[in-house]
Protein backbone atom coordinates (compact mmCIF):
# COMPACT_ATOMS: atom_id res chain seq x y z
CA UNK A 1 0.00 0.00 0.00
CA UNK A 2 1.01 3.67 -0.12
CA UNK A 3 2.28 5.66 -3.05
CA UNK A 4 4.52 3.93 -5.56
CA UNK A 5 7.39 6.39 -5.06
CA UNK A 6 7.68 6.41 -1.27
CA UNK A 7 8.98 3.80 1.11
CA UNK A 8 7.96 3.41 4.71
CA UNK A 9 10.44 4.24 7.46
CA UNK A 10 11.91 1.28 9.32
CA UNK A 11 14.23 0.56 12.27
CA UNK A 12 12.55 3.25 14.35
CA UNK A 13 14.74 3.58 17.44
CA UNK A 14 14.56 5.76 20.55
CA UNK A 15 17.84 7.29 21.66
CA UNK A 16 17.54 8.86 25.09
CA UNK A 17 19.86 9.87 27.93
CA UNK A 18 18.72 11.83 31.00
CA UNK A 19 15.50 12.50 29.03
CA UNK A 20 17.21 14.14 26.05
CA UNK A 21 15.36 12.06 23.46
CA UNK A 22 15.53 11.68 19.72
CA UNK A 23 13.81 9.19 17.45
CA UNK A 24 15.97 7.77 14.66
CA UNK A 25 14.93 5.74 11.64
CA UNK A 26 15.95 4.53 8.20
CA UNK A 27 16.27 4.86 5.23
CA UNK A 28 18.05 8.01 4.09
CA UNK A 29 15.35 9.55 1.90
CA UNK A 30 15.47 9.51 -1.88
CA UNK A 31 12.82 11.77 -3.39
CA UNK A 32 10.79 11.69 -0.21
CA UNK A 33 10.41 13.58 3.04
CA UNK A 34 9.25 12.65 6.52
CA UNK A 35 6.99 14.04 9.22
CA UNK A 36 6.87 12.60 12.74
CA UNK A 37 3.93 12.40 15.09
CA UNK A 38 4.03 11.59 18.80
CA UNK A 39 1.29 10.77 21.23
CA UNK A 40 0.63 9.32 24.65
CA UNK A 41 -1.66 6.31 24.73
CA UNK A 42 -4.61 8.48 25.62
CA UNK A 43 -3.61 11.73 23.90
CA UNK A 44 -3.84 13.36 20.51
CA UNK A 45 -1.14 13.08 17.89
CA UNK A 46 1.25 16.03 17.69
CA UNK A 47 3.25 16.60 14.52
CA UNK A 48 6.97 17.40 14.70
CA UNK A 49 9.85 17.71 12.24
CA UNK A 50 7.64 18.62 9.30
CA UNK A 51 8.65 17.47 5.81
CA UNK A 52 12.23 16.80 6.79
CA UNK A 53 14.90 14.92 4.89
CA UNK A 54 16.52 14.02 8.21
CA UNK A 55 16.27 10.54 9.66
CA UNK A 56 15.97 11.79 13.22
CA UNK A 57 13.59 13.96 15.21
CA UNK A 58 14.20 15.51 18.61
CA UNK A 59 11.14 14.74 20.74
CA UNK A 60 12.54 15.94 24.06
CA UNK A 61 10.10 18.85 24.33
CA UNK A 62 7.16 16.44 24.14
CA UNK A 63 8.34 13.65 26.43
CA UNK A 64 9.49 15.94 29.25
CA UNK A 65 5.90 17.13 29.69
CA UNK A 66 5.28 13.88 31.57
CA UNK A 67 8.18 11.46 31.78
CA UNK A 68 6.07 8.72 33.36
CA UNK A 69 3.71 8.50 30.40
CA UNK A 70 4.18 5.93 27.65
CA UNK A 71 4.73 7.45 24.21
CA UNK A 72 4.27 6.17 20.70
CA UNK A 73 5.66 7.89 17.62
CA UNK A 74 5.05 7.32 13.95
CA UNK A 75 6.99 8.45 10.92
CA UNK A 76 5.10 9.42 7.75
CA UNK A 77 6.68 9.27 4.30
CA UNK A 78 5.67 11.72 1.58
CA UNK A 79 6.91 12.17 -1.98
CA UNK A 80 9.25 15.18 -2.13
CA UNK A 81 7.47 18.19 -3.59
CA UNK A 82 4.06 16.52 -3.27
CA UNK A 83 3.34 16.27 0.42
CA UNK A 84 -0.43 16.16 -0.16
CA UNK A 85 -0.06 12.80 -1.87
CA UNK A 86 -1.55 9.86 0.00
CA UNK A 87 -1.42 6.11 -0.18
CA UNK A 88 -4.03 3.81 -1.64
CA UNK A 89 -5.85 3.72 1.68
CA UNK A 90 -6.22 7.51 1.60
CA UNK A 91 -3.34 8.33 3.93
CA UNK A 92 0.44 8.53 3.60
CA UNK A 93 2.65 5.58 4.39
CA UNK A 94 3.76 5.48 8.00
CA UNK A 95 5.53 3.23 10.46
CA UNK A 96 5.04 3.05 14.24
CA UNK A 97 7.86 3.23 16.76
CA UNK A 98 8.19 0.92 19.72
CA UNK A 99 6.49 2.28 22.82
CA UNK A 100 8.74 4.42 25.01
CA UNK A 101 8.36 5.28 28.69
CA UNK A 102 11.06 7.84 29.51
CA UNK A 103 11.04 7.30 33.28
CA UNK A 104 11.67 3.59 32.84
CA UNK A 105 13.88 3.62 29.76
CA UNK A 106 15.98 6.76 29.36
CA UNK A 107 19.66 5.95 29.77
CA UNK A 108 21.37 7.34 32.83
CA UNK A 109 24.08 9.76 31.79
CA UNK A 110 27.64 9.39 33.01
CA UNK A 111 27.79 10.95 36.49
CA UNK A 112 30.47 13.36 37.67
CA UNK A 113 32.20 13.47 41.05
CA UNK A 114 31.72 17.05 42.19
CA UNK A 115 34.08 17.00 45.15
CA UNK A 116 35.60 14.95 47.94
CA UNK A 117 36.77 16.05 51.35
CA UNK A 118 38.83 14.13 53.84
CA UNK A 119 38.53 14.77 57.56
CA UNK A 120 40.78 12.39 59.47
CA UNK A 121 39.83 8.85 58.48
CA UNK A 122 36.54 9.84 56.84
CA UNK A 123 36.05 10.98 53.25
CA UNK A 124 32.90 12.70 52.04
CA UNK A 125 32.36 12.18 48.28
CA UNK A 126 29.72 14.29 46.53
CA UNK A 127 28.16 13.41 43.18
CA UNK A 128 27.04 16.28 40.97
CA UNK A 129 23.23 16.39 40.80
CA UNK A 130 22.93 16.85 37.08
CA UNK A 131 20.22 19.05 35.65
CA UNK A 132 17.81 17.51 33.18
CA UNK A 133 15.53 19.13 30.61
CA UNK A 134 12.46 18.20 32.67
CA UNK A 135 10.87 21.39 33.96
CA UNK A 136 8.60 22.26 36.84
CA UNK A 137 7.43 25.82 37.43
CA UNK A 138 9.78 26.96 34.69
CA UNK A 139 12.92 25.59 36.35
CA UNK A 140 14.96 22.59 35.25
CA UNK A 141 14.74 19.61 37.57
CA UNK A 142 17.81 17.65 38.58
CA UNK A 143 18.13 13.91 38.12
CA UNK A 144 17.47 13.50 41.85
CA UNK A 145 14.35 15.71 41.62
CA UNK A 146 12.96 13.46 38.89
CA UNK A 147 13.89 10.02 40.23
CA UNK A 148 13.87 10.65 43.98
CA UNK A 149 14.83 7.56 45.97
CA UNK A 150 14.50 5.35 42.87
CA UNK A 151 17.99 6.59 41.98
CA UNK A 152 21.01 5.38 43.90
CA UNK A 153 24.71 5.87 43.36
CA UNK A 154 27.38 3.23 43.76
CA UNK A 155 30.84 4.39 44.75
CA UNK A 156 33.90 2.36 43.81
CA UNK A 157 37.02 3.31 45.74
CA UNK A 158 40.50 1.90 46.09
CA UNK A 159 43.92 2.78 47.42
CA UNK A 160 46.08 4.40 44.75
CA UNK A 161 48.72 1.85 45.63
CA UNK A 162 46.52 -1.23 45.09
CA UNK A 163 43.84 -2.57 42.78
CA UNK A 164 41.37 -4.01 45.32
CA UNK A 165 38.09 -2.10 45.00
CA UNK A 166 35.53 -1.45 47.71
CA UNK A 167 31.98 -0.27 47.13
CA UNK A 168 29.46 1.91 48.93
CA UNK A 169 25.89 2.87 48.05
CA UNK A 170 23.73 5.90 48.74
CA UNK A 171 20.24 7.09 47.87
CA UNK A 172 21.39 10.70 48.24
CA UNK A 173 24.24 12.31 46.31
CA UNK A 174 26.78 11.94 49.12
CA UNK A 175 28.94 9.16 50.51
CA UNK A 176 30.78 9.09 53.81
CA UNK A 177 33.40 6.36 53.83
CA UNK A 178 36.18 5.19 56.12
CA UNK A 179 39.73 5.33 54.81
CA UNK A 180 43.16 4.48 56.14
CA UNK A 181 45.12 7.43 57.40
CA UNK A 182 47.97 8.53 55.19
CA UNK A 183 46.68 6.61 52.14
CA UNK A 184 45.54 8.20 48.88
CA UNK A 185 42.35 6.83 47.33
CA UNK A 186 40.75 6.93 43.91
CA UNK A 187 36.99 7.14 43.31
CA UNK A 188 34.48 6.42 40.59
CA UNK A 189 30.69 6.48 40.78
CA UNK A 190 27.84 4.92 38.86
CA UNK A 191 24.17 5.88 38.77
CA UNK A 192 21.76 2.98 39.26
CA UNK A 193 17.98 2.56 39.28
CA UNK A 194 17.60 -0.88 40.92
CA UNK A 195 13.87 -1.17 40.19
CA UNK A 196 14.39 -1.06 36.43
CA UNK A 197 14.51 -4.03 34.12
CA UNK A 198 16.46 -2.25 31.35
CA UNK A 199 19.06 0.52 31.33
CA UNK A 200 19.61 0.08 35.08
CA UNK A 201 23.14 1.50 35.24
CA UNK A 202 25.07 4.42 33.84
CA UNK A 203 28.63 4.22 32.65
CA UNK A 204 31.18 4.89 35.38
CA UNK A 205 32.18 8.47 36.10
CA UNK A 206 35.72 9.60 35.30
CA UNK A 207 38.11 8.48 38.04
CA UNK A 208 39.11 11.12 40.60
CA UNK A 209 42.03 10.58 42.97
CA UNK A 210 43.08 12.19 46.23
CA UNK A 211 46.03 14.50 45.87
CA UNK A 212 44.46 16.05 42.79
CA UNK A 213 42.66 19.39 42.58
CA UNK A 214 39.04 18.21 43.04
CA UNK A 215 39.42 17.20 46.64
CA UNK A 216 40.18 18.84 49.89
CA UNK A 217 42.28 17.27 52.60
CA UNK A 218 42.02 18.26 56.23
CA UNK A 219 44.15 16.57 58.83
CA UNK A 220 42.43 16.52 62.21
Amino acid sequence: SGTTNTVAAYNLTWKSTNFKTILEWEPKPVNQVYTVQISTKSGDWKSKCFYTTDTECDLTDEIVKDVKQTYLARVFSYPAGNVESTGSAGEPLYENSPEFTPYLETNLGQPTIQSFEQVGTKVNVTVEDERTLVRRNNTFLSLRDVFGKDLIYTLYYWKSSSSGKKTAKTNTNEFLIDVDKGENYCFSVQAVIPSRTVNRKSTDSPVECMGQEKGEFREI
Epitope: T17, Y51, E56, T132
Partner: antibody, heavy 118, light 107 residues
Framework: QVQLVQSGAEVKKPGSSVKVSCKAP????????ISWVRQAPGQGLEWMGR????????NYAQKFQGRVTITADKSTSTAYMELSSLRSEDTAVYYC???????????WGQGTLVTVSS | AIQLTQSPSSLSASVGDRVTITCRAS??????LAWYQQKPGKAPKLLIY???ILESGVPSRFSGSGSGTDFTLTISSLQPEDFATYYC?????????FGGGTKVEIK
Protein backbone atom coordinates in the same frame (compact mmCIF):
# COMPACT_ATOMS: atom_id res chain seq x y z
CA GLN B 1 22.93 35.09 28.92
CA VAL B 2 24.79 32.04 27.63
CA GLN B 3 28.39 32.77 26.68
CA LEU B 4 30.34 30.51 24.36
CA VAL B 5 34.07 31.23 24.59
CA GLN B 6 36.28 30.01 21.77
CA SER B 7 40.02 29.40 21.64
CA GLY B 8 42.36 31.93 20.03
CA ALA B 9 43.43 32.52 16.44
CA GLU B 10 45.62 29.91 14.73
CA VAL B 11 48.04 29.99 11.83
CA LYS B 12 48.53 26.60 10.18
CA LYS B 13 50.48 25.07 7.32
CA PRO B 14 48.70 23.35 4.42
CA GLY B 15 48.19 19.66 5.13
CA SER B 16 48.15 20.09 8.90
CA SER B 17 45.20 19.97 11.33
CA VAL B 18 43.59 22.51 13.62
CA LYS B 19 41.48 21.92 16.73
CA VAL B 20 39.25 24.76 17.92
CA SER B 21 37.54 24.68 21.32
CA CYS B 22 34.27 26.20 22.50
CA LYS B 23 33.62 26.44 26.23
CA ALA B 24 30.02 26.72 27.39
CA PRO B 25 28.51 27.35 30.82
CA UNK B 26 27.87 24.31 32.96
CA UNK B 27 24.30 23.24 33.58
CA UNK B 28 22.49 22.05 30.51
CA UNK B 29 25.54 22.04 28.17
CA UNK B 30 25.16 18.30 27.54
CA UNK B 31 21.63 18.61 26.24
CA UNK B 32 21.98 21.36 23.68
CA UNK B 33 23.27 20.75 20.20
CA ILE B 34 26.49 22.59 19.40
CA SER B 35 27.08 23.35 15.72
CA TRP B 36 30.15 24.68 13.96
CA VAL B 37 29.73 27.28 11.23
CA ARG B 38 32.52 28.87 9.22
CA GLN B 39 32.83 32.09 7.24
CA ALA B 40 35.59 32.64 4.71
CA PRO B 41 36.79 36.25 4.31
CA GLY B 42 34.07 38.33 2.64
CA GLN B 43 31.86 35.25 2.20
CA GLY B 44 28.65 33.85 3.69
CA LEU B 45 28.01 31.35 6.46
CA GLU B 46 28.60 27.62 5.99
CA TRP B 47 27.41 24.92 8.39
CA MET B 48 30.02 22.21 9.03
CA GLY B 49 28.42 19.81 11.52
CA ARG B 50 27.05 19.39 15.01
CA UNK B 51 27.07 17.29 18.17
CA UNK B 52 24.57 16.49 20.91
CA UNK B 53 27.02 15.95 23.77
CA UNK B 54 24.87 13.78 26.03
CA UNK B 55 23.86 11.42 23.23
CA UNK B 56 27.23 11.44 21.51
CA UNK B 57 25.42 12.00 18.24
CA UNK B 58 27.44 13.93 15.66
CA ASN B 59 26.90 14.54 11.97
CA TYR B 60 28.62 16.54 9.32
CA ALA B 61 27.98 18.39 6.09
CA GLN B 62 28.95 16.18 3.18
CA LYS B 63 31.57 18.68 2.03
CA PHE B 64 33.54 18.15 5.25
CA GLN B 65 32.86 14.45 5.80
CA GLY B 66 36.07 12.60 6.60
CA ARG B 67 37.97 15.82 7.29
CA VAL B 68 36.11 17.20 10.29
CA THR B 69 35.58 15.67 13.72
CA ILE B 70 33.35 17.27 16.33
CA THR B 71 33.62 16.08 19.93
CA ALA B 72 32.52 17.25 23.36
CA ASP B 73 33.85 16.88 26.88
CA LYS B 74 30.99 16.98 29.35
CA SER B 75 33.27 17.35 32.35
CA THR B 76 34.61 20.68 31.10
CA SER B 77 31.50 21.76 29.12
CA THR B 78 33.68 22.14 26.05
CA ALA B 79 33.00 21.26 22.41
CA TYR B 80 35.80 20.80 19.88
CA MET B 81 36.04 20.96 16.11
CA GLU B 82 39.07 19.41 14.44
CA LEU B 83 39.67 19.98 10.74
CA SER B 84 42.42 18.01 9.02
CA SER B 85 44.25 18.17 5.69
CA LEU B 86 44.03 21.95 5.75
CA ARG B 87 44.24 23.94 2.54
CA SER B 88 44.37 27.66 1.85
CA GLU B 89 40.62 27.78 1.16
CA ASP B 90 39.98 26.68 4.76
CA THR B 91 41.15 30.14 5.89
CA ALA B 92 38.04 31.40 7.69
CA VAL B 93 36.50 32.45 10.94
CA TYR B 94 35.10 29.37 12.67
CA TYR B 95 32.13 29.86 14.98
CA CYS B 96 30.52 27.51 17.45
CA UNK B 97 26.83 28.11 17.99
CA UNK B 98 24.21 26.62 20.28
CA UNK B 99 21.06 25.38 18.66
CA UNK B 100 17.93 26.60 20.41
CA UNK B 101 14.78 24.58 21.01
CA UNK B 102 14.87 23.80 17.32
CA UNK B 103 17.87 24.21 15.02
CA UNK B 104 18.25 27.94 14.83
CA UNK B 105 21.28 29.40 16.60
CA UNK B 106 20.43 31.45 19.66
CA UNK B 107 23.98 31.85 21.02
CA TRP B 108 27.27 32.14 19.16
CA GLY B 109 30.92 32.05 20.13
CA GLN B 110 33.06 35.07 19.31
CA GLY B 111 34.71 33.24 16.41
CA THR B 112 38.21 31.85 15.85
CA LEU B 113 40.25 32.95 12.86
CA VAL B 114 42.17 30.09 11.28
CA THR B 115 44.69 31.13 8.65
CA VAL B 116 46.16 28.44 6.41
CA SER B 117 49.34 29.63 4.76
CA SER B 118 52.67 28.18 3.74
CA ALA C 1 20.69 19.82 0.56
CA ILE C 2 18.09 22.56 0.69
CA GLN C 3 19.25 25.68 -1.16
CA LEU C 4 18.28 29.16 0.05
CA THR C 5 18.35 32.03 -2.43
CA GLN C 6 18.39 35.48 -0.89
CA SER C 7 17.61 38.66 -2.76
CA PRO C 8 18.79 41.26 -3.26
CA SER C 9 22.44 40.53 -2.49
CA SER C 10 22.87 44.17 -1.52
CA LEU C 11 20.76 47.29 -1.22
CA SER C 12 21.21 50.95 -0.37
CA ALA C 13 18.68 52.64 1.85
CA SER C 14 18.25 55.66 4.08
CA VAL C 15 17.39 55.95 7.75
CA GLY C 16 13.62 55.68 8.10
CA ASP C 17 13.16 53.59 4.93
CA ARG C 18 11.15 50.38 4.86
CA VAL C 19 13.40 47.51 3.77
CA THR C 20 12.33 44.08 2.54
CA ILE C 21 14.61 41.09 2.00
CA THR C 22 13.39 37.83 0.53
CA CYS C 23 14.57 34.25 0.93
CA ARG C 24 13.41 31.38 -1.28
CA ALA C 25 13.92 27.70 -0.35
CA SER C 26 14.44 24.99 -2.96
CA UNK C 27 11.79 22.84 -1.26
CA UNK C 28 9.03 23.16 1.33
CA UNK C 29 10.55 23.89 4.74
CA UNK C 30 7.27 24.71 6.51
CA UNK C 31 8.13 27.59 8.87
CA UNK C 32 11.61 26.33 9.80
CA LEU C 33 13.44 29.51 8.89
CA ALA C 34 15.52 31.97 10.91
CA TRP C 35 16.96 35.40 10.16
CA TYR C 36 20.28 36.76 11.47
CA GLN C 37 22.00 40.12 11.48
CA GLN C 38 25.80 40.28 11.23
CA LYS C 39 28.05 43.29 11.63
CA PRO C 40 31.70 43.32 10.49
CA GLY C 41 34.01 41.40 12.81
CA LYS C 42 31.11 40.10 14.92
CA ALA C 43 29.21 36.84 15.20
CA PRO C 44 25.72 36.69 13.69
CA LYS C 45 22.82 37.63 15.96
CA LEU C 46 19.47 35.83 15.89
CA LEU C 47 16.56 38.12 14.96
CA ILE C 48 13.67 35.85 14.02
CA TYR C 49 12.95 32.11 14.17
CA UNK C 50 10.04 29.93 13.04
CA UNK C 51 9.74 32.40 10.13
CA UNK C 52 7.93 35.08 12.15
CA ILE C 53 8.75 34.87 15.87
CA LEU C 54 10.84 37.77 17.13
CA GLU C 55 13.75 36.74 19.36
CA SER C 56 13.64 38.27 22.83
CA GLY C 57 15.26 41.72 22.92
CA VAL C 58 15.02 42.33 19.16
CA PRO C 59 13.31 45.63 18.24
CA SER C 60 9.75 45.33 16.92
CA ARG C 61 10.66 47.14 13.68
CA PHE C 62 11.96 43.74 12.53
CA SER C 63 9.35 41.28 11.32
CA GLY C 64 9.30 38.04 9.36
CA SER C 65 6.68 36.31 7.30
CA GLY C 66 6.22 33.38 4.95
CA SER C 67 5.85 29.63 4.95
CA GLY C 68 6.72 26.78 2.63
CA THR C 69 9.28 28.15 0.20
CA ASP C 70 8.93 31.96 0.25
CA PHE C 71 9.97 34.12 3.19
CA THR C 72 10.44 37.81 3.88
CA LEU C 73 12.32 39.89 6.44
CA THR C 74 11.03 43.44 6.82
CA ILE C 75 12.58 46.37 8.67
CA SER C 76 9.73 48.86 8.99
CA SER C 77 11.86 51.95 9.65
CA LEU C 78 15.59 51.55 9.13
CA GLN C 79 17.78 52.80 11.98
CA PRO C 80 21.50 53.67 11.84
CA GLU C 81 22.40 50.52 13.79
CA ASP C 82 20.57 48.32 11.25
CA PHE C 83 23.21 48.74 8.53
CA ALA C 84 24.62 45.21 8.42
CA THR C 85 24.44 41.94 6.49
CA TYR C 86 21.36 39.75 6.92
CA TYR C 87 21.22 35.98 6.45
CA CYS C 88 18.34 33.51 6.33
CA UNK C 89 18.86 29.93 7.56
CA UNK C 90 16.68 26.86 7.19
CA UNK C 91 16.46 24.43 10.08
CA UNK C 92 14.01 21.99 8.54
CA UNK C 93 16.67 19.42 7.69
CA UNK C 94 20.36 18.70 8.02
CA UNK C 95 22.60 19.89 6.52
CA UNK C 96 21.56 23.27 7.86
CA UNK C 97 21.97 25.88 5.14
CA PHE C 98 22.16 29.67 4.91
CA GLY C 99 21.20 32.14 2.23
CA GLY C 100 24.01 34.05 0.55
CA GLY C 101 23.34 37.19 2.58
CA THR C 102 21.99 40.68 1.91
CA LYS C 103 24.18 43.67 2.68
CA VAL C 104 22.19 46.74 3.72
CA GLU C 105 24.26 49.86 3.08
CA ILE C 106 23.70 53.57 3.69
CA LYS C 107 22.48 55.43 0.63
Amino acid sequence: QVQLVQSGAEVKKPGSSVKVSCKAPRGTFSYYTISWVRQAPGQGLEWMGRIIPILGVANYAQKFQGRVTITADKSTSTAYMELSSLRSEDTAVYYCAREGDRRYFDYWGQGTLVTVSS
Amino acid sequence: AIQLTQSPSSLSASVGDRVTITCRASQDISSALAWYQQKPGKAPKLLIYDASILESGVPSRFSGSGSGTDFTLTISSLQPEDFATYYCQQFNSYPLTFGGGTKVEIK
